[in-house]
Amino acid sequence: ENFNVATEESSEPLGEDDFEMFYETWEKFDPDATQFIAYSRLSDFVDTLQEPLRIAKPNKIKLITLDLPMVPGDKIHCLDILFALTKEVLGDSGEMDALKQTMEEKFMAANPSKVSYEPITTTLKRKHEEVCAIKIQRAYRRHLLQRSMKQASYMYRHSHDGSGDD
Amino acid sequence: MADQLTEEQIAEFKEAFSLFDKDGDGTITTKELGTVMRSLGQNPTEAELQDMINEVDADGNGTIDFPEFLTMMARKMKDTDSEEEIREAFRVFDKDGNGYISAAELRHVMTNLGEKLTDEEVDEMIREADIDGDGQVNYEEFVQMMTAK
């Protein structure tokens, strides 16, 4: 009965087997059943899935564009990944929204002890943050370099100015 | 100019380019350029995009091939960021939009993202940035100090 919304017919693009395959693969990447995966392992995870949910490597940019929510520690919730991959297959539709809601309700109800999580960023925002961090880091390293060059120049001049005193 | 890019950067650009080259003909439309660049973490304005297109789309046919795209990205990466661009970069981490970033948040960002600073570098950065030692960094002033000639 799992996920029988949008999986009634065998001709449907997504079936119960696909969701089972997702969770079986998930278990290998999250053996402690935390429900989260490190962003750094996401590329390997989606490449390990079978069609139609698989996103083959190179897939880093694709995963950025999926705009997945991330929680502190750069971790992503399994449901958010499953929703995004399902959306890739089914497209954006009312049917997709209904499936997402059903899956979410079933998942939360089946795991009533799990703490609800608060995403702080997304994969797309994180990429932008990376680029912005690099701008600041490069500017600061340039500043350090210029400052050390000025100091060296000052020391050089100072030592030469005083050299005629002997 | 593309030889100034690392293998990793070229691979990333290739992936982004291919993702939006829907029909696989080796070109993207100038309309898609913004989307491609955003997927690479850039946030160009419409005016900036137009300037880039004018530079590389010499024949004006509204498409860009990968070598042209690579040249454009290499140019963008080579350019030294202006004071305003660095201020904009800081603004991304200013969640409250009040012109301040906590020293702790700045340390976290600088040592966990991008071209990570060493502990020594970040200690020095915070010493310079948090002048009064109240744990808050006024990044407007810090950027001015950093970019002063």
Partner: nanobody
Framework: QVQLQESGGGLVQPGGSLRLSCAAS????????LAWSRQAPGKQREFVAS????????YYSGSVKGRFTVSRDNAKETVYLQMNDLKPEDSAVYYC?????????????????WGRGTQVTVSS
Amino acid sequence: QVQLQESGGGLVQPGGSLRLSCAASGLTFANYDLAWSRQAPGKQREFVASIGVTRNPPYYSGSVKGRFTVSRDNAKETVYLQMNDLKPEDSAVYYCAAKDASVTVATIEDYPYWGRGTQVTVSS
């Protein structure tokens, strides 16, 4: 081994109430998520309610929300389902299920431990 034993079912008139109990043995009860599920003749088993080990509020299916209340007594190793304002469509066999709270599953169907069920019939 793990055993779940439901009780408290029976025949009740529409608008009436029943309280189901599920006694557990063979597991560290306080560490287990518990759920109630039901199955009417010729229909698929459906989720009713679940309760965890943390302070999170319980979950209820839309069809029973506001009428049913799930609770647990760790000392007695028992989970309860208080059913008020019963309707004919609530008639079904009610099952109790359990899983280790530290384990994540996709749906209630994946719970490893199930009771044999207790029949609830709502009829005038």
